[in-house]
């Protein structure tokens, strides 16, 4: 009789994660009695898979039944695969020995391949807002795919950007990988509704890549423009002044008047009306009695954007030491002038 | 280690049954059948039947057919043989023994369990 | 079914000496290219005890003086030189079908 041999008839089998991996051997005679037992790697550290004789193997399977006399198939069927799967696995043959089997022979081995989908990209912005031409960064994170072999795309609105730097870890050889990118894209004042999209495409995705978006809406901060003026008088001896304050986003703003420096007024934006870029407008006014001042009037719109420093636009009301039939449109004069 | 334990010696009257344990520890219960032996006193070896514990298959010896039922308790790695309508010539020292190597041989043995039946 | 015949019934061989012990089958047991046919050593107050297995393979841990041979009917069991432990009773039993036992050998010392 032929001395058993020990055939491993795949050399490599690719398996994608979730799935159920078959790992064939066959042994060439009954001879020598004793069990099969599978293990992962070879050498002193390698891991066992499955023992005929003993152990408790929960995610694997016989493919034939070992119990049936005859029987040379020891394939064995390992469920839920992991990309900490992925490794060679030999089918070693034992022949029945006291007190413990001995080593018989082993196949020629068979390596698993793990094919692992990738997280869904996660893509993450800069901490603090940042202003219309200012650079930004952007990163995008995936994990846990299998092979190395991705690619990353970002997209603003549609339009692939050029502008970014993409690293896969590790270098070496792994059960899994991770990538990660960063993207430098310049804000515009139109980018409230912008939306920065990391693209992943892999092997395993079947040509339907895996996206995540990022809104530019909680990054960008676009400063308001403020606008001061004199309305027309509403009644004798007042004068109504109103402060627009236009394009800003985010909404979260407090504006202050201030009438020679003093504080007349707070208020915080509430009814807002919004743009159609996303941008908000809001108006404050003030109703001045000019018969109370005795001097000229420096009337100041003081706004405090998203807690940022107050920007300011005053205006002067000069006060009229004329008598009242000179009519109230005579009554103030005004100069606007912009402080920060 | 394998290691097959069998239940202690039994003493029946004519007509009555008697259950014999066997129980396996040092290898996976499911995986190897279970033979059934059994020796008069002074005379040959005599194959009863085999279990196979992961299904419960079973092949039996003609002879003990209709007289002999052959069970598992895979939660206890335990094989049972009950030998029914029992006459004085059951009188033997009955043996357990598992298949190792699955071709229908025996490779470890139980100590043997000594049935006698006796009016 | 198969019927297993052992020759002889009993044998007594010098210590030293080669013992043979035949066993014939009423019908071939061989099938799948073995020989379905194992031999088994039971020594007074003992179970059985495995000794050659598929006709001419030594069981693990059996003296390599225990030799089986043979092929479709007619199967033998030699000790190539007899020790005192090896007084025992020698039984064939074959697995072609389902398995039967030869009647036994008893093999003393002369």
């Known amino acids: 009789e032929e001395e058993l041999q020990v055939i491993q008839p795949d050399k490599s089998v690719l398996v994608a994660a979730g799935e159920t991996a078959t790992l064939r051997c066959t042994a060439t005679s009954l001879i020598p009695v004793g069990p099969i037992q599978w293990f992962r790697g070879a050498g002193p550290g390698r891991e066992l898979i499955y023992n005929q004789k003993e152990g408790h193997f929960p995610r694997v399977t016989t493919v034939s039944d070992l119990t049936k006399r005859n029987n040379m198939d020891f394939s064995i069927r390992i469920s839920n695969i992991t990309p900490a799967d992925a490794g060679t696995y030999y089918c070693v043959k034992f022949r029945k020995g006291s007190p413990d089997d001995v080593e018989f022979k082993s196949g020629a081995g068979t390596e698993l391949s793990v094919r692992a989908k990738p997280s869904a990209p996660v893509v993450s912005g800069p901490a603090a807002r940042a202003t219309p031409q200012h650079t930004v960064s952007f990163t995008c994170e995936s994990h846990g795919f299998s092979p190395r072999d991705i690619t990353l795309k970002w997209f603003k609105n549609g339009n692939e950007l050029s502008d970014f730097q993409t690293n896969v870890d590790p270098v070496g050889e792994s059960v899994s990988y991770s990538i990660h990118s960063t993207a430098k894209v310049v804000l515009t004042r139109e980018d409230v509704h912008s939306q920065v999209i990391c693209e992943v495409a892999h092997v395993t995705l079947q040509g339907d890549p895996l996206r995540g978006t990022a809104n530019l809406s909680e990054t960008i901060r676009v400063p308001p423009t403020l606008e001061v003026t004199q309305q027309p008088v509403r009644a004798e001896n007042q004068v109504n002044v109103t402060c627009q304050v236009r394009k800003f986003y985010p909404q979260r703003l407090q504006l202050t008047w201030l009438e020679n420096g003093n504080v007349s007024r707070t208020e915080t934006a509430s009814t807002v009306t919004e743009n159609k870029d996303g941008t908000y407008n809001w108006m404050s006014w003030l109703l001045v009695n000019v018969s109370a001042h005795r001097d000229d009037v420096k009337l100041t719109c003081q706004v405090e954007h998203d807690g940022q420093p107050a920007v300011s636009k005053s205006h002067d009301l000069k006060v009229s030491a004329h008598p009242k039939e000179q009519g109230s449109n005579t009554a103030a004069e005004n100069t606007g002038s912009n402080e920060r | 280690q394998v290691q097959l334990v069998q239940s202690g010696a039994e003493v029946k009257k004519p007509g009555a049954s008697v259950k014999v344990s066997c129980k396996a520890s040092?290898?996976?219960?499911?995986?190897?059948?279970i033979n059934w032996v059994r020796q008069a006193p002074g005379q040959g070896l005599e194959w009863i039947a085999m279990?196979?514990?992961?299904?419960?298959?079973?092949h039996y010896n003609q002879i003990f057919k209709d007289r002999a039922t052959l069970t598992t308790d895979t939660s206890t790695s335990t094989a049972y043989m009950e030998l029914r309508s029992l006459r004085s010539d059951d009188t033997a020292v009955y043996y357990c023994?598992?298949?190792?190597?699955?071709?229908?041989?025996?490779?470890?043995w139980g100590r043997g369990t000594l049935v006698t039946v006796s009016s | 079914d198969i019927v297993l015949t052992q020759s002889p019934d009993s044998l007594a061989v010098s210590l030293g000496e080669r013992a043979t012990i035949n066993c014939r089958a009423s019908?071939?047991?061989?099938?799948?290219?073995?020989?379905?046919i194992f031999w088994y050593q039971q020594k007074p107050g003992q179970p059985p005890k495995l000794l050659i297995y598929?006709?001419?393979n030594r069981d693990s841990g059996v003296p390599d003086r225990f030799s089986g041979s043979g092929s479709g009917t007619d199967f033998t069991l030699t000790i190539s030189s007899l020790q005192a432990e090896d007084v025992a009773v020698y039984y064939c039993?074959?697995?072609?079908?389902?398995?039967?036992f030869g009647q036994g050998t008893k093999l003393e010392i002369k």
């Open positions: 023994a598992m298949d190792y190597g699955s071709l229908y041989a025996m490779d470890y």
């Open positions: 040092g290898y996976t219960f499911t995986n190897y059948w």
């Open positions: 279990i196979d514990p992961s299904d419960s298959e079973t």
């Open positions: 019908q071939s047991v061989r099938s799948s290219g073995y020989n379905w």
């Open positions: 598929l006709a001419s």
């Open positions: 039993q074959h697995s072609r079908e389902l398995p039967t």
